[in-house]
Interface confidence: low
């Protein structure tokens, strides 16, 4: 009679975490007499998964009724699969012996791989804001997936980025894996409304990748441009001086007017106008009573934006160019009349 063969028809199977795995095994003969055992791994240290005769295996059930006299199907089903169950499973026939059974023949093995979904990617940016033209780093992390093969892409406003480095850990065997990627992004002045997206594709996601996003509004600081101008007003001895603060982000801004280096007024930006690109504009103005000045006046608009060192713009007001009222050197009242910002 032909010698017994142990047939494991599936070279490999892949199962999603939480599902059941069926491991098929049939034998071609009822001889020799002896039990079947299932192991994970081969050689030293193999792990017993199921023993036909004894032991408690709560997650393992047999597909066929092993008590039937002519049964030759020793397939098993393992319930509630987790990534820790991955490995190669062997169906092994033993020959009855005394005192111990003797291993007679092993199946070729079925490699079980477990598919576990990655967690939603978490994208984080730098701790401090940066200005346009600077390169900033974003990190993306996702955990708990299996198998190890995974694809990660970075996008900025739909455009794929190429400057990034990705690691999958651990390098060797693990029940599940984590991915960590760092992308470098060059900021531009138009990036207030921009988004950085980390996209993770994995076999468990059926072509519907997971995405994590970061808004560059949390990262960028666009410093303002200043322009100081003067317009005459109807009153002959008054000049309206305005400080236009343009294209800044975020909103936090404090403006100080200086007259010949001395603080005249400080105000905090309030009623801002928003530009299409997400930056803001603001204007502050002063009414200058020219008749109160004997000499030329240096007016400085000094702006402190988002806690950064102050930037300033000055304007020289030529007093000599304006007609003086009689007795203007003793004229009462302030030299500078402050006005609420527009």
């Amino acid at each position: 009679e032909e010698e017994l063969q142990v047939i494991q028809p599936d070279k490999s199977i892949s199962v999603a975490a939480g599902e059941s795995a069926t491991l098929h095994c049939t034998v071609t003969s009822l001889i020799p007499v002896g039990p079947i055992q299932w192991f994970r791994g081969a050689g030293p240290g193999r792990e017993l998964i199921y023993n036909q005769k004894e032991g408690h295996f709560p997650r393992v059930t047999t597909v066929s009724d092993l008590t039937k006299r002519n049964n030759m199907d020793f397939s098993i089903r393992i319930s509630n699969i987790t990534p820790a169950d991955a490995g190669t499973y062997y169906c092994v026939k033993f020959r009855k012996g005394s005192p111990d059974h003797v291993e007679f023949k092993s199946g070729a093995g079925t490699e079980l791989s477990v598919r576990a979904k990655p967690s939603a990617p978490v994208v984080s940016g730098p701790a401090a804001r940066a200005t346009p033209q600077h390169t900033v780093s974003f990190t993306c992390e996702s955990h708990g997936f299996s198998p190890r093969d995974i694809t990660l892409k970075w996008f900025k406003n739909g455009n794929e980025l190429s400057d990034f480095q990705t690691n999958v850990d651990p390098a060797g065997d693990s029940v599940s894996y984590s991915i960590h990627s760092t992308a470098k992004v060059v900021l531009t002045r138009e990036d207030v409304h921009s988004q950085v997206i980390c996209e993770v594709a994995h076999v468990t996601l059926q072509g519907d990748p997971l995405r994590g996003t970061a808004n560059l509004s949390e990262t960028i600081r666009v410093p303002p441009t200043l322009e100081v101008t003067q317009q005459p007003v109807r009153a002959e001895n008054q000049v309206n001086v305005t400080c236009q603060v343009r294209k800044f982000y975020p909103q936090r801004l404090q403006l100080t007017w200086l007259e010949n280096g001395n603080v005249s007024r400080t105000e905090t930006a309030s009623t801002l106008t928003e530009n299409k690109d997400g930056t803001y504009n603001w204007m502050s103005w002063l009414l200058v009573n020219v008749s109160a000045h004997r000499d030329d006046v240096k007016l400085t608009c000094q702006v402190e934006h988002d806690g950064q060192p102050a930037v300033s713009k000055s304007h020289d007001l030529k007093v000599s160019a304006h007609p003086k009222e009689q007795g203007s050197n003793t004229a009462p009242g302030p030299a500078l009349a402050s006005a609420a910002p527009l």
């Epitope: 791994g41 792990e47 850990d169 651990p170 390098a171």
Partner: antibody
Framework: EVQLVQSGAEVVKPGASVKLSCKAS????????MHWVKQAPGQGLEWIGA????????TYNQKFKGKATLTVDKSASTAYMELSSLRSEDTAVYYC???????????????WGQGTLVTVSS | DIQMTQSPSSLSASVGDRVTITCRAS??????LNWLQQKPGKAPKRLIY???SLDSGVPSRFSGSGSGTEFTLTISSLQPEDFATYYC?????????FGGGTKVEIK
């Protein structure tokens, strides 16, 4: 039976390079990570890095980056480690050992090569 | 990196003694720890995997226990062939790291 057979002892001059080999037999070579471990004379064991023959994916201990380069020849079931810019402190026995790709605790570092002694001397 | 601190670094014992070696991980490694035995001039040999599972052919006087960060290798009754150096090895996270070793010598 699984066997890892390593190349013979090497005596090399400082500044030179050496390439060690580790041939696997008795199992599917590609479904395991091949690791390399250093043991300096009278010292303990240090993990250098590992390579996965399926796609030549490598991982290194930061300490050995730039010192060790791991490669494989799948057709010959052989893993290689090249050590460069050798110095006296690289004198050691280098072992190859292997671990399973999936979560099979039983297959971690059970099989070891016999070791290759590298002596760096002028 | 995960640091593995092994103690003692050496010990003297007699045949028949009970010997305990401990290994502490700097962070949780679950049960992913091996114990290896190495004799002079030989490659390491794994005795225990996954903290407490005995390799086939390893005498039952060897046992392992612990989880998380604290692990123990126990030799219940030391035999002449057990005089060697023992290492713990974590394989939970790359880079994989070994303990510093414990040399078991004859008293």
């Amino acid at each position: 039976e699984v066997q890892l057979v390593q190349s013979g002892a090497e005596v090399v001059k400082p500044g030179a390079s050496v390439k060690l080999s580790c041939k696997a037999s008795g199992s599917t070579f590609t479904s395991y990570w091949m690791h390399w471990v250093k043991q300096a004379p009278g010292q303990g064991l240090e993990w250098i890095g590992a390579i996965y023959p399926v796609n030549s994916d490598t991982t290194y201990n930061q300490k050995f980056k730039g010192k060790a380069t791991l490669t494989v020849d799948k057709s010959a079931s052989t893993a290689y480690m090249e050590l460069s810019s050798l110095r006296s402190e690289d004198t050691a026995v280098y072992y190859c050992t292997r671990s399973f790709y999936y979560s099979l605790d039983a297959a971690w570092f059970v099989y070891w090569g016999q070791g290759t002694l590298v002596t760096v001397s002028s | 990196d995960i640091q593995m601190t092994q103690s003692p670094s050496s010990l003297s014992a007699s045949v028949g003694d009970r010997v305990t070696i401990t290994c502490r991980a700097s962070q949780d490694i679950g049960s992913r720890l091996n114990w290896l035995q190495q004799k002079p001039g030989k490659a390491p040999k794994r005795l225990i995997y996954a903290t407490s599972s005995l390799d086939s052919g390893v005498p039952s006087r060897f046992s392992g226990s612990g989880s998380g960060t604290e692990f123990t290798l126990t030799i219940s009754s030391l035999q002449p062939e057990d005089f060697a150096t023992y290492y713990c090895l974590q394989y939970a996270s790359s880079p994989f790291t070994f303990g510093g070793g414990t040399k078991v010598e004859i008293k």
